[in-house]
Structures are given as C-alpha cells and as structure tokens.
C-alpha cells in the first residue's frame, strides 16, 4: 500500500456532539474527534514517491534522490528525501486533500537531517494553498506557512516559522535555535484555534505563546499621540549653573609662566642668538577654565514622555491562526553543501498522534543511529592512526635507506670472521 | 559589526569599464549579503545588484542585466562591481551595502534591509 | 515592474509630527525599509521591516504599513532630522527604492 495516506476531517459533527467534546472559543467552534491525517509519507515503498511528489520542471535545479545516507538507525525506515548536488536550488512538492484548519489544531512535523556537517542550506517546509502550480514552485510563490530549521554560516541557525497573513509574510520575533549536528531530528509546529502556538524539536517544546504577541500581524494596540509634542518651557535639565556663584578674583592666572630658576647662558650673544628668554613652565598657580557650581533646576519636570493613544487602525483578530485552503506541501530550498535527508512527514491536527508519530518513527531509530555514527567514527579514527603509523614507518624506512647511502661504505667480512674478530678482541 | 571600505574616485571615458571594490572587514564576509547602489547627482538611490559570497552566485536588476557582474572574493572578504560600455548617464556615487545574512534564501537578507553602508565611490564618465 | 511613490518634499516645525509616505500597489504585502541620507553622507537604515528601529536610531522614528501605503514617522522632530528619506521594498527578487522625500525642518 502507499505510504501517503490522506484521511478526512475525521467523525460527523453528530459523534462529536454526543461524545460531548465541544468547546467554544471567540466565536470559533472546534474540536478534538478522531484525528484527521491530511498528509503522510515516510517513503517506505521504494521508488513510489516519485508518482506523488512534483518537481520543478527546470534543468539547473537539484535532484532529490531516495536515501538513508551513510548512516543510520533502520535502512529502510529511515529513507527520505535526499538533496543530492551542490550549490543549488531545489523544488520539489507533494499535493493532497485540500483542507481548512479554521476551528481546528494544525500540526505540521517532519525529520531533518543535515549529515553533510552543513554550511548553508535549507531544513524547512512550506505549506502551499491547492492553487499552486506545482511545476513552477519557486522561491517568490505564495504560501500559508513555512516551517523548519535554516542554517547559513555563522550567523544563521534558526527555526524559521512563518505565516502568510493578508498577503504578506510574517516572520517570528523570537529567535527559535535550531539542532546543526549530523543526526536526524525531529521538527513539530502546532497551530490553534484559540491563536497560540508550539514549537517543538525532538518532541520537546522549545518555544511556545500566543501569535499576536510574537508576530507582528497586527498593528500596535497604542500609538504616539501624533497632535502631543513637547511644550517649549519643558525643562528637561535636572542640573543647571548656580546663578549666584560668581568667578573669584584671583581665578584667572596663565596657564604657563617664565621659569624664575632659569638663568642666561653665559656665552649668549645677543647679537648673534637674539634677545634671550627663559623656558616657559607650567604655572602652579594655573586653575583652569572656571565653572559656576551645579544646582538642582528648581524648573525640572523630567524627561517628556510622548503621551500615547489608543491606535485607531488596531482591532484584534481571533482568525490569525486559519487558512481556507492547505492543499500543497513543498520543498523550495538552496543548499550550498548538499546531503540532508527529510522523512516522516505528517500533517494532522491532532496534538496526541503527532507526537506518538514522532516516537515510533524518529524515537525508534535515533539511538541506532547515533551508535552507528559512532562506530563509523571510531572506525574512521582507527584507520586514520594505521595510516599515521604506515606513513611513519615509510618515513623511518627512507630515513634508514638515507642513512645507509649516505655513510661510507665498510669491507664486508663474513659472518664467521666477524664472529671471531669478536672472540679476539674480547 | 562589518565595515565597508570602497576604493577611491574614477575618471573614465565613454565606452569603457570600471571596477569598483569594496572591502568587508570586523565581521565574518560569509554572513552577509553585498548589494551595490547608485545615485546619479541630484537623484535618488537606484538598485543594480547584489550578491551572497557563501553562494557565490548574484542577482541584477533587468536594467543593468548584461552590463554589471557582481562578484566576491572571499578570501580577502572583498566584494566588486563592475559596470561596463560607460556612457555619461554612468556618472554617479557608486555605494556597496551590507544586509545580514539571516538564512539559506535569496529573500531572506532583503527582510532585513541594508543597514551598513560603505562611504560611496565617484565615478565620472567624460569624453 | 514594481514602483515606489514618494512626496517629493514634506516639511514639519521643530518639535512637531513629521510623516512621509510611500505609495505601491498592496505595499502591506512587502517588508518595508527606510533610509535617510544627509548631505553628502551615505544612507543610514533607520526603519527595517515596516517598524522595526535598528540599534542606535532615536525613538522618535516609527514606522507603519498597510493597504497601498507605508508611512515613515518621526515625532518631535528635531533639526538634525533634516535630510531625504528612501523607502525601500524587495519584489520579484529585486530592490526597489522610491523617488525620496526631502524634509525640511522649519525655522
């Protein structure tokens, strides 16, 4: 069978009614029946995905190919998608059910792994309405959300979560740090109804709150007031110079005075060195630039403050979280260094099943996977110390070759006469 | 944070090329994005490309396509722009600006705008 | 392509609210850039992604977007915020900038 499964909305309103799961929040009726799964591949039937998944129709793009890389926990269960050249775009997509998640959680989920050591490159999805030509995805095409880890360089490493909100794409203001090791990790964002939202990594929250609050998808709730500006007598200096503090007579002295010690030379000729005139030193006396004493401004009244006002443009919105339409899930990505694996994607709104997912899929396989890692290391290690030590006994070798040629060369004896000279000489 | 350093003032003739450079320096060149920005006396700020050195690949506007490259030398962290076939409307102060690189996408650093500038090059084209 | 509207010139009294706008066709869809560039100086970002103030630019400077406007605004001006100002938009990859606004401060 394949490994997309797409279910619908789940039980009939009547189930629902009767199971007594109703709640009510700001107007929006929803509910946690069955669990709808809109989307799921774990691309486990082989050279199936190809029949479900759209590519770019644009030669320089880069290939996905099917892969569990080098390694991992399961061969089979841990193949996914995986870039294979670099430095390129790539695009690639997958349609299904088109479905609204107004009323109701989203969960978006899927594995990552970047066992290329990446550099620049691209962990994230985005989920498309079913109006998009799936042949010409690119970078520049509308989305409802885009979800995932992102990494370029030093300064990028990062859960990007976005929204498409009126046309326009809005990105979090809170720094979500993403996982950069070579092992596969698991992403989850949860959307709800009542406009908070979740982020979790290996099933863990990361970061959580409400979507008003960490997007700007609404304009401020307060404003300067544009008609308040400062009055002109506003005094905003809380020290000012002592109107009765007058400079002493005595304060203004020069800075450098005549040294009294110096003496003319006794061979000065004023003829020739013209007028004589002693080194100039500086004046003890000298008190420098003088400054009225500081009193508290009697006419003080602190910093002014722009008074603010409700903002007229400001009205809440509790839709923020739905979209009329999912219908596409894709892959629009540049990767520098290629090699990163995606699997196990699911979209479903229920909260409970997504993360049971996660367990059997990524829970099941990270600690064979991190074994054979290890193993692969200490294999590298080991070969690496043979080579070392095959490299040192080459060295040693030729030094010994070198030396041979270079001393000179001695009568050969025989053993036996050797032996002997030996017996002899002791 | 970066600073741009770009070399000094041109006198070119009609029909020629200029190449002007653009030094990066107290950041990691990797980091960001170089976009180049003209302004012809007396007018506003017009856009002629940019590039991202860890991708090494630049885009330009349609007006100046097949008249400017764009490229970056990573390992001095030096941007350039060249700008062939001069004509007199190519007089301008010619400036290179930097955008943090916050992700794997050419969009990404242009969320951000262009918040270091480098001090702007003169090139004069005269017959 | 895309296009960027911006008046010419705006003027405002020392202390009062100064407001610059920049016209394009549902500009709420796009992230929202501003600069200002005083004489003979390069450009100084001083609004990125339709409000947001880098580090080092005075509270006085907000911004706002939505419908087919942007709006830069500085209240309480002062005379040192005398200069043109560039809004600035990224569409169909590619930078586009507005014509640029002098403001005058008066008096």
């Known amino acids: 069978s394949s490994s997309l499964e797409v279910l619908f909305q789940g039980p009939g309103l009547n189930d629902i009614f009767e199971a007594q799961k109703i709640e009510w929040h700001e107007e929006n009726l929803y509910f946690q029946g069955e669990p709808a799964v809109y989307f799921k591949e774990q691309f486990l039937d082989g050279d199936g995905w190809t029949s479900r998944w759209i590519e770019k129709h644009k030669s320089d793009f880069g290939k996905f190919v099917l892969s569990s890389g080098k390694f991992y926990g399961d061969e089979e269960k841990d193949k996914g998608l995986q870039t294979s050249q670099d430095a390129r775009f790539y695009a690639l997509s997958a349609s299904f059910e088109p479905f609204s998640n107004k009323g109701q959680t989203l969960v978006v989920q899927f594995t990552v792994k970047h066992e290329q050591n990446i550099d620049c490159g691209g962990g994230y999805v985005k989920l498309f309405p079913n109006s998009l030509d799936q042949t010409d995805m690119h970078g520049d095409s509308e989305y409802n959300i885009m979800f995932g880890p992102d990494i370029c360089g030093p300064g990028t490493k990062k859960v990007h979560v976005i929204f498409n909100y009126k046309g326009k794409n809005v990105l979090i203001n809170k720094d979500i740090r993403c996982k950069d090791d070579e092992f596969t990790h698991l992403y989850t964002l949860i959307v709800r109804p009542d406009n908070t939202y979740e982020v979790k990594i290996d099933n863990s929250q990361v970061e959580s709150g409400s979507l008003e609050d960490d997007w700007d998808f609404l304009p401020p709730k307060k404003i300067k007031d544009p008609d308040a500006s400062k009055p002109e007598d506003w005094d905003e200096r809380a020290k000012i110079d002592d109107p009765t503090d007058s400079k002493p007579e005595d304060w203004d002295k020069p800075e450098h005075i005549p040294d009294p010690d110096a003496k003319k030379p006794e061979d000065w000729d004023e003829e020739m060195d013209g007028e004589w005139e002693p080194p100039v030193i500086q004046n003890p006396e000298y008190k420098g630039e003088w400054k009225p004493r500081q009193i508290d401004n009697p006419d003080y009244k602190g910093t002014w403050i722009h008074p603010e006002i409700d903002n007229p443009e400001y009205s809440p919105d509790p839709s923020i979280y739905a979209y009329d339409n999912f219908g596409v899930l894709g892959l629009d990505l540049w990767q520098v260094k290629s090699g990163t694996i995606f699997d196990n994607f699911l979209i479903t709104n229920d909260e409970a099943y997504a993360e049971e997912f996660g367990n059997e899929t990524w829970g099941v396989t990270k600690a064979a996977e991190k074994q054979m890692k290890d193993k692969q290391d200490e294999e590298q290690r080991t070969r690496r110390m043979m080579r070392t030590k095959m490299r040192m006994r080459r060295m040693r070798r030729t030094r010994r070759k070198m030396r041979r040629k270079m001393s000179p060369a001695r009568p050969r004896t025989s053993c036996r006469e050797a032996c002997l000279q030996g017996w002899t000489e002791a | 944070e970066v600073q741009l350093v770009q070399s000094g003032a041109e006198v070119k003739k009609p029909g020629s090329s200029v190449k002007v450079s653009c030094k990066a320096s107290?950041?990691?060149?990797?980091?960001?994005?170089i976009s180049w920005v003209r302004q012809a006396p007396g007018q506003g700020l017009e856009w002629m490309g940019g590039?991202?050195?860890?991708?090494?690949?630049?885009n330009y506007a349609q007006k100046f396509q097949g008249r400017v490259t764009i490229t970056a030398d990573e390992s001095t962290s030096t941007a350039y722009m060249e700008l062939s076939s001069l004509r007199s409307e190519d007089t301008a102060v010619y400036y290179c600006?930097?955008?943090?690189?916050?992700?794997?996408?050419?969009?990404?650093?242009?969320?951000?705008?262009?918040?270091?500038w480098g001090q702007g090059t003169t090139v004069t084209v005269s017959s | 392509s895309y296009v960027l509207t911006q008046p010419p010139s705006v003027s405002a009294a020392p202390g009062k609210t100064a407001r610059i706008s920049c016209g394009g066709n549902?500009?709420?869809?796009?992230?929202v850039h501003w600069y200002q560039q005083k004489a003979g100086q390069a450009p100084v970002l001083v609004i990125y992604?339709?409000?947001k103030r880098p580090s080092g630019i005075p509270e006085r400077f907000s911004g706002s977007n939505s419908g087919n406007t942007a709006t830069l605004t500085i209240s309480g001006t002062q005379a040192m915020d005398e200069a043109d100002y560039y809004c600035?938009?990224?569409?169909?990859?590619?930078?586009?900038f507005g014509g640029g606004t002098k403001l005058t401060v008066l008096g």
């Open positions: 992604q339709d409000s």
């Open positions: 590039i991202i050195p860890i991708f090494g690949t630049a």
């Open positions: 549902n500009i709420r869809s796009k992230s």
């Open positions: 600006a930097s955008s943090p690189l916050r992700g794997s996408g050419w969009y990404w650093h242009y969320y951000y705008g262009m918040d270091v």
């Open positions: 107290g950041g990691t060149f990797s980091s960001y994005a």
């Open positions: 600035q938009a990224w569409d169909s990859n590619t930078v586009v």
